[in-house]
Structure formats: C-alpha cells, structure tokens
Interface confidence: low
C-alpha cells in the first residue's frame, strides 16, 4: 500500500535503533571515506527529520522518496569533490539516475587501512562508556570496507558483537574471552560479505531472473516438502529483498526481510518442519537463523525425475506452453532431490536441460533426442565431485597454510599478470575452503566447496575488472556466474606470460618481520612465493618447496639470533643467491 510519507512508514516499521543503524550503513557504503563523526551527524539529522514526519506526515518534504532525501543529504556534504572526485558529479543528476550513479561509484577495494581491533581493556572501556557509539563505529567501519554487505545481517553481527562484549568485559581475563569469540564473528561476517557480493553481482550482471533461479534451487534444497508454488513465492520475496539491499534501499530491504521471516514462521506447515527453533528467536536472530536453517527431511515418495521431464511424451509441448515455469519446475524437482549438490551445479544442469530441449524440440523425433539428457549430466556432476576429492585430499595432507600455498602457486601460474596482493588474498581465501568444508560430512562437502569458491572467485573478478591485466581472468569472468569456477579450474599455465626479472629487493627481509603476528608473517612469505612463481612460472613443485623451506629456516634462524639485524643483512643476500641457483 502507498504511504503518505515513506520515511515515517519505515521509521515506524523498523523502530529507532534499527532505523538509525541502517541509515548509518547506507551512508557508510555510499561515501566510504567519510569519518564516523561526519556520518553520525547526518544520521541524527535524518532521524530527527523522520520523527517530525511520524508526528505529521504532511510536514514539508515528508512525501519525498528515500533516495531523494538521502541523496540530498549526501550531496550537501562539504568538500565532496575534494574528497570523492567524480562521485560529486552524481549530485548534478536527478533521481533515479543520481542513486544509480552513487551505486556505480561504490568501491569494492577501498584504500582504507585494515580494521584493527583495539586491545581488550581499551575496547571494554569505550564499550562501557558508550555502547551505542561503540556499535556505531563497528557498523561504520565494516560497511565502508564492504559496500555491499547485507545490511540487516550486519545489524545481526553488531548484535553478536554487543553480546560478546557485554559477556567478556565482565570477566577477569577479557582478552582470552574476547579473542576467539570476536575472531569467530569476523570470520562469519567476511564469508557473509563475499556471499552477498556474489548475489549482488548476479543481480547486476544477469538480472532478477538469474537471482531467482539461484533462489529456487537453494530454497528447494532446504525445503523439499514445500510445493513449487510455495518455493516460487519465497524465491520472489527473497529476490525483492536482495534487489533492494543491492540497490542501496536498505530500509525497504530490512523491512521486507522481516516480513518474509514473519511469513515463513506463520506458514511452517507448508514450508518446513525445521523452522520452529528459528521462529522462537527475536527478529535479527530469527532472520539469520532462517537463512541458514538445516535442510528438511526429503519426502519419501518422490517419483523419478525422468517421469515428467524425459519419459513424458509431451515434454516439448509442456516446455513450449510455459518455458520459464517448466524449467523452474525442473530446477525445483531436481534441487529438492539433491541437497548434496551445489547451487552452481544445479543451475548448470538446468542450463544443460534447457539447451537440450531447445535443440531436441526442433527435431523430427524429440523424445529420441532428449531421452539421454540425464545421462549427459554425468560429466557435469563428476567434475566438481573430483575437484572436491582432489582438493580435500591435498588439504588433509598439507594443512591450511600449505594448502593456501599450493593454490597460490597454481593461480599465479594461471594468471601471473594479476597483482601479487590480489593473488595472495585470493589464495588465502580459497585455501580456507579446506578448513570450512573438507571436515564436513561427505554429502555436505560439494555444496560447501563449490558455492564458497564461486563467491571468492567473484571477488577476484570484481578486483580484476578495475584493472584488467590477464586475458585468462577476463575470459573466465566474462562468462556466466555458474561457469566461472569450472573455467578457473580448467586454466593452465599462461604460456603468453614473459617471466618477471629477478629483483633481489623483492626477496630482501628485515628483522621487523620477527615481531609480526603469525598471519602477517604468512602473508610476507606468500608474497615472496608468488613473486618466485612470477619469476619462474614453470618452476617445479620440488624447486619451490626447496626455496620456501630454505626461506622459512632463514627466518627462524635470524629471528632467534641475538643480533637479528646483522643476521638478516648477512644471511639475506646468501638466501637470495641460493634461491636464484635453486630455480636456475
């Protein structure tokens, strides 16, 4: 229904706390360089204005759209051009072009320092002094670094953060209470960020239909007892929610997500028997819980998929009468039978089925032509299954760090032109798939591995789009989202690459490395490894292992030495010489 004042409507629906949080996230995602204080001031002004509209919907400007109100606020910021360059040109446009312009200027890799966590005592002090400001800083810092973070989910993580601080700041040993818990939230939030970015990419590049297909597959796996009409309704609603969040309409997105959660909890009987635990929780926890609820038990009486989609003599007629509905039903029926497949794989199978019908239904004897379609799925299914087996075996053999290094070598050979920091970030993220997925039961491994890899590779594509340097990467990133992972997996050594000159300074280290946290040390070593591969793309695994072992031993020796600086300055050049010899 239409409301006289959109901003009053959203303020009433969401309540002041969530309203303020979402407006802060929206501003931080649009203007990523502004300080917290600048944004907090704008948020307060918008909130005060919303309250006047709640009191009187006919008050001046209350009838304006949220894009107009928010855009006007952002465009009124002083020194916009000095700080944001051409983003200031957006302010010369009218809505909806102005909002589109802001969206296009979102930076997936902003040049901001890493979000450093203060030490426990300081954190607890500032949290106790002003919990609201503390949480505001958290929302601001995460949102500006992740401009597509799913806003209602970020509110959930802020709530988690709040609960952890409330609990741990009351303990004697704050540090050991906070560190593992906050690390856990950070890890989950980072995964949530890349997954949501993938959804927004799907929406931006391929439209709502592509996202809806993803949603149908995912929901059918989770809710195999829901009928197609129910799955279609949920997929349609979920598509709307995600479209709004990806489009910067965060108040509408959060409001509609709450509505969807409410609908699911009111209709458990026709959706799933596993929802009750989630539905007993308060709003943010409920919606989060529903988004990762376990799969319902599959119905026992499901007929073979072939009955309707291969053996029925009227397949082509059914397909011609309602193509999207027929293909949607195929995706639904196949997905509900295969919770053990990744969504990417299910979408590839649906695509193959569609291509087969397009070809066969134009022939003289369609049933003879499409009769073998399910058998033709076999290689498509085997490929990711083999990928999972090979990579999980390797992970079990090498551990996370060793597995990351193996991936780093592989990907540097595939795309040596890509910048070393991007390769290291990608390899570290791809390598985490082992810890995340390889320990799961067999039937959960494939969906976990492939859908996670797809999300990480989407980030690789986004970063590469900014400064395209590798034809290999461009080729894989230009195709459809579901084909990306197989495309990257199939890449081999880039034969067109001219090896990098050997520069001694790239492999020169100083004693300051010794005091770095373990993660930073690993990144330094992995940076050196990528540079080695760029120098010798065809180096064997044995050669690279020799060099890296030597390097690790050198660091270990010098970091234990009484005079670290002398050790680094004398042993360093010897290491460089040995590296060159080993790779010659």
């Amino acid at each position: 229904e239409a409301h006289k004042s959109e901003i009053a409507h959203r303020y009433n629906d969401l309540g002041e706390q969530h309203f303020k949080g979402l407006v802060l996230i929206a501003f931080s995602q649009y203007l990523q360089k502004c300080s917290y204080d600048e944004h907090a001031k704008l948020v307060q002004e918008v909130t005060d204005f919303a309250k006047t509209c709640v009191a009187d919907e006919s008050a001046a400007n209350c009838d304006k759209s949220l894009h107009t109100l928010f855009g006007d606020k952002l465009c009124a910021i002083p020194n916009l051009r000095e700080n944001y360059g051409e983003l200031a040109d957006c302010c010369t446009k009218q809505e909806p072009e102005r909002n589109e312009c802001f969206l296009q200027h979102k930076d997936d890799n902003p040049s901001l320092p890493p979000f450093e966590r203060p030490e426990a005592e300081a954190m607890c002090t500032s949290f106790k002094e002003n919990p609201t400001t503390f949480m505001g800083h958290y929302l601001h810092e995460v949102a500006r670094r992740h401009p597509y973070f799913y806003a209602p989910e970020l509110l959930y993580y802020a709530e988690q953060y709040n609960e952890i601080l409330t609990q741990c700041c009351a303990e004697a040993d704050k540090e050991s209470c906070l560190t593992p818990k906050l690390d856990g939230v950070k890890e989950k939030a980072l995964v949530s960020s890349v997954r949501q970015r993938m959804k927004c990419s799907s929406m931006q590049k391929f439209g709502e239909r592509a996202f809806k297909a993803w949603a149908v597959a995912r929901l059918s796996q989770t809710f195999p007892n829901a009928d197609f009409a129910e799955i279609t309704k949920l997929a349609t609603d979920l598509t709307k929610v995600n479209k709004e969040c990806c489009h910067g309409d965060l108040l509408e997105c959060a409001d509609d997500r709450a509505e969807l959660a409410k609908y699911m909890c009111e209709n458990q009987a026709t959706i799933s028997s596993k929802l009750q635990t989630c539905c007993d929780k308060p709003l943010l926890k409920k919606a989060h819980c529903l988004s990762e609820v376990e799969h319902d038990t599959m119905p026992a009486d499901l007929p073979a998929i072939a009955a309707d989609f291969v053996e029925d003599q009227e397949v082509c007629k059914n397909y011609a009468e309602a193509k999207d509905v027929f293909l949607g039903t195929f995706l639904y029926e196949y997905s509900r039978r295969h919770p053990d497949y990744s969504v990417s794989l299910l979408l590839r199978l649906a695509k193959k089925y569609e291509a087969t019908l397009e070809k066969c239904c134009a022939e003289a004897n369609p049933p003879a032509c499409y009769g073998t379609v399910l058998a033709e799925f076999q290689p498509l299914v085997e490929e990711p299954k083999n990928l999972v087996k090979t990579n999980c075996d390797l992970y079990e053999k090498l551990g996370e760090y060793g597995f990351q290094n193996a991936i780093l070598v592989r990907y540097t050979q595939k795309a040596p032109q890509v910048s070393t920091p991007t390769l290291v970030e990608a390899a570290r993220n791809l390598g985490r798939v082992g810890t995340k997925c390889c320990t799961l039961p067999e039937d959960q491994r494939l969906p976990c591995v492939e859908d996670y890899l797809s999300a990480i590779l989407n980030r690789v594509c986004l970063l590469h789009e900014k400064t395209p340097v590798s034809e290999h990467v461009t080729k894989c990133c230009s195709g459809s989202l579901v084909e990306r992972r197989p495309c990257f997996s199939a890449l081999t050594v880039d034969e067109t690459y001219v090896p990098k000159e050997f520069k001694a300074e790239t492999f020169t280290f100083h004693s300051d490395i010794c005091t770095l946290p373990e993660k930073e040390k690993q990144i330094k070593k992995q940076t050196a490894l990528a540079e080695l591969v760029k120098h010798k793309p065809k180096a064997t695994a044995e050669q690279l292992k020799t060099v890296m072992d030597d390097f690790a031993q050198f660091l270990d020796t010098c970091c234990k030495a009484a005079d670290k600086d002398t050790c680094f300055s004398t042993e360093g050049p010897n290491l460089v010489t040995r590296c060159k010899d080993a790779l010659a």
């Epitope: 197609f228 119905p299 309707d308 003599q313 009227e314 029926e333």
Partner: nanobody, 126 residues
Amino acid sequence: EVQLLESGGGLVQPGGSLRLSCAASGRYIDETAVAWFRQAPGKEREFVAGIGGGVDITYYADSVKGRFTISRDNSKNTLYLQMNSLRPEDTAVYYCAARPGKPLITSKVADLYPYWGQGTLVTVSS
C-alpha cells in the same frame, strides 16, 4: 492417502454440455497435480486434461482443447471438468486422478497417478 469421488456423468445429446465434479478428501486438492482421464469401451485409458499442484497451469489433450475446461475450487476441495460441444467420440468412463508430491507438471502418463476415483460414465448419443 487421497480419496476421490466423481459425479456428474450421464446421457447427453451431441453438442450438449456436462459438468463433472471430483470431490477429494485426505489431502488438499491444490497440493496435488490432478487430472481427468477417460476410457472408452475396448480402448486404452487416455489423458483428457490436467492442472498442476499449487499453480493453476492447465494442460489439455488436443482432441478436447477449446471444448473442455478443467478447474478446481480449493475451498470445496473439488476438481471440475466443464465439457461443452460434446461429440459421440467423447463417450467413455471419466476418471479423476491425483499425484502427491505437489508437482506442477501434470503428466499425461496414467501410471504416474497413484490415486484414482471409481469413474463416472458419460454417454453422448442422439
């Protein structure tokens, strides 16, 4: 378990109309794919019309398209077949059939329907 009970059959002249009903119990009719089949004396059972589970997408045999209309009333848990411009070759026992598992697609294959009514006879003759 779904029980189906047809009614509405009878004798009608060529060009006339009849409306068959199929009352379902044991499961909501909108949760299953439902169809009408018919069997003329000495012939095989053939698909007439079907409607998908959950979404009202309808399918018809070529021989009845434009003359017959399948519909359902969820509040009464009943399936209907409105038959207009009847011909002598429409004479047969008409059966109502249901498929659980809520499939959208109504198959033309009789074997895929586990639940059947006892049938109602339609005779078209002058």
